[in-house]
């Protein structure tokens, strides 16, 4: 069993989606093993709970790793009230959490 720490990426909502009145921020964890990984969302440094959903892929047939996407969903109005969006990832292959973030309006 070879441990692989996740590569972590964060994606802001598209302009197209914002036009529809909602905002989905996505945190993507790629190619990790074992499957246990934790994602925490912070908005302007405040921990979010209850408004995110996770989806994990089955093990990759080539390298037996997993990928996971966590989606934080907000209304467009709530999204525009805040500036810094961050996802914090913990996994046994990481000695400390990995945080990826962006400032709304600067990406």
């Amino acid at each position: 069993r070879t441990v692989a720490a996740p590569s972590v990426f964060i994606f802001p909502p598209s302009d197209e989606q914002l036009k529809s009145g909602t905002a989905s921020v996505v945190c993507l964890l790629n190619n990790f093993y074992p499957r246990e990984a934790k994602v925490q969302w912070k908005v302007d440094n405040a921990l979010q709970s209850g408004n995110s959903q996770e989806s994990v892929t089955e093990q990759d047939s080539k390298d037996s790793t997993y990928s996971l996407s966590s989606t934080l969903t907000l209304s467009k109005a709530d999204y525009e009230k805040h500036k810094v969006y961050a996802c914090e990832v913990t996994h046994q292959g990481l000695s400390s959490p990995v945080t990826k973030s962006f400032n709304r309006g600067e990406c």
Epitope: R1, E36, A37, K38, T90, H91, Q92, L94, S95, P97
Partner: nanobody, 126 residues
Framework: QVQLQESGGGLVQAGGSLRLSCAAS????????MAWFRQAPGKEREFLAS??????????????FYGDSAEGRFTISNDNARNTGYLQMNSLKPEDTAVYYC?????????????WGQGTQVTVSS
């Protein structure tokens, strides 16, 4: 609280072996997983290996995991009666020179480390 103390580091010739120990004290019954990391100067701390101390819903006690750089040369083990974890390191190379740390977590789904030792220096000379 759990306290961890590493020992067994030192100076060794390339091709040699060392066995590191990590003695746990305090609330050792709460340890679910113990791991070894290392940190070379100017580099990030790197995962080497881990072992499940107490079985849970996902893994049996004694299940081991290895990082790429430890696979095949390093072996992790533990002795629950002595509350000690071990890292046997064989065929050491100069690039294995680093400070070696043990870490532990009480999480049944181990995704972060609650406890860290102070580290032990390993120097491999060519």
């Amino acid at each position: 609280q759990v306290q961890l103390q590493e020992s067994g580091g030192g100076l060794v010739q390339a091709g040699g072996s060392l066995r590191l120990s990590c003695a746990a004290s305090g609330r050792t019954s709460s340890i679910h997983l113990m791991a070894w990391f290392r940190q070379a100067p100017g580099k990030e701390r790197e995962f080497l290996a881990s072992i499940i101390w107490t079985g849970g819903t996902t893994y049996y006690a004694g299940t081991t995991f290895y990082g790429d750089s430890a696979e095949g040369r390093f072996t992790i083990s533990n002795d629950n009666a002595r509350n000690t974890g071990y890292l046997q390191m064989n065929s050491l190379k100069p690039e294995d020179t680093a400070v070696y740390y043990c870490a532990a977590t009480s999480l049944v789904n181990p995704t972060r480390y609650d406890y860290w030792g102070q580290g032990t220096q390993v120097t491999v000379s060519s």
